[in-house]
């Protein structure tokens, strides 16, 4: 199969300005490509084929180009409809791959994190598991690490993350990071931390509780 | 306004068997080709099978052929993707795809919103 890999994966960028993102096949794809633009909860939209060509209805402002392997998608001054995801997909062979996407997101002014750190309920304990929450609120940019230390142990592999969109007023982000486990395991220890590095904090920042005493 | 809507995805155990269908309204989709995508979390948006016009038959990624069947009935204007032998691997949101023209352009001017397959093992 023919791979699609675009860059970046994330672009920060202002009203007005002319954005590029890149896409290069893993073959020569001739000229057969497409890009598309998807919002959050939306189909995505055809935007542009035959790496140039643009799709009905679609503004000037998007401009293709390329061929081969390189090509590139320019919006040329950015309209606020215009912060999404978009996808560039090849059509030159029969298993029509899709690129992994360029999110264009707001460029905001970096903002540190307010941390929080929430046990499990009584009434979630009764069902057998136990969900630790640390909570991440209104950080730019998105990149953020969450460790999670039991007993100042850390842990790995038994937490999920989760980050909401983009704040549409101040552009930040939230981010959630759930760490599962066993009623018993929970259970076996005291001492339950959440740290989080942000570009924001001059250190990390670290949350915890002692089981039993909250 | 063409829509898509796609139907029957669920849980099912692994080597089991799902019927998914996409109906369309606002376009006769006999002239068009329909596809089927999929994507699981992380991961590209991926080619499954193509129902080309009636008569021009079908095509499969590597990884559903010989356990996908993908089936259009143009008069209740539906394609039908048939997925036996299912994997923790096949995994994903299931979506269709209209061909933007008649002639097999491989672009898609509208989507489904997608229906949840989860195999587990």
């Known amino acids: 199969d023919i791979q699609m890999t675009q860059s970046p994966s994330t672009l920060s960028a202002s009203v007005g300005d002319r954005v590029t993102i890149t896409c290069r096949a893993s073959q020569s794809i001739n000229t057969w490509l497409a890009w598309y633009q998807q919002k959050p909860g939306k189909a995505p939209k055809l935007l542009m084929y035959k790496a140039s060509s643009l799709e009905s209805g679609v503004p000037s402002r998007f401009i293709g180009s390329g061929s081969g392997t390189e090509f590139t998608l320019t919006i040329s001054s950015l309209q606020p409809d215009d912060f999404a995801t978009y996808y560039c997909q090849q059509y030159n062979s029969d298993s029509k791959m899709f690129g992994q996407g360029t999110k264009v997101e707001v460029k905001g002014t970096v903002a540190a994190p307010s941390v929080f750190i929430f046990p499990p309920s009584d009434e979630q304990l009764k069902s057998g598991t136990a969900s630790v929450v640390c909570l991440l609120n209104n950080f730019y940019p998105r990149e953020a690490k969450v460790q999670w230390k039991v007993d100042n142990a850390l842990q790995s592999g038994n937490s999920q993350e989760s980050v909401t969109e983009q704040d549409s007023k101040d552009s930040t982000y939230s981010l959630s990071s759930t760490l599962t486990l066993s009623k018993a395991d929970y259970e076996k220890h005291k001492v339950y931390a959440c740290e989080v590095t942000h570009q924001g904090l001059s250190s990390p920042v670290t949350k915890s509780f002692n089981r039993g005493e909250c | 306004q063409v829509q898509l809507q796609e139907s029957g995805g669920g849980l099912v155990q692994a080597g089991g068997s799902l019927r998914l269908s996409c109906a369309a309204s606002g376009r006769t989709i006999s002239r068009y080709a329909m596809s089927w995508f999929r994507q699981a979390p992380g991961k590209e948006r991926e080619f499954v099978a193509v129902a080309r016009r009636s008569g021009d038959g079908a095509f499969y990624s590597d990884s559903a052929e010989g356990r996908f069947t993908v089936s259009r009935d143009d008069a209740k204007n539906t394609v039908y993707l048939q997925m036996n032998s299912l994997k923790p691997e096949d995994t994903a949101v299931y979506y269709c795809?209209?061909?933007?023209?008649?002639?097999?352009?491989?672009?898609?001017?509208?989507w489904g919103q997608g229906t949840q397959v989860t195999v587990s093992s």
């Open positions: 795809a209209i061909d933007s023209s008649t002639d097999y352009t491989g672009t898609y001017d509208y």
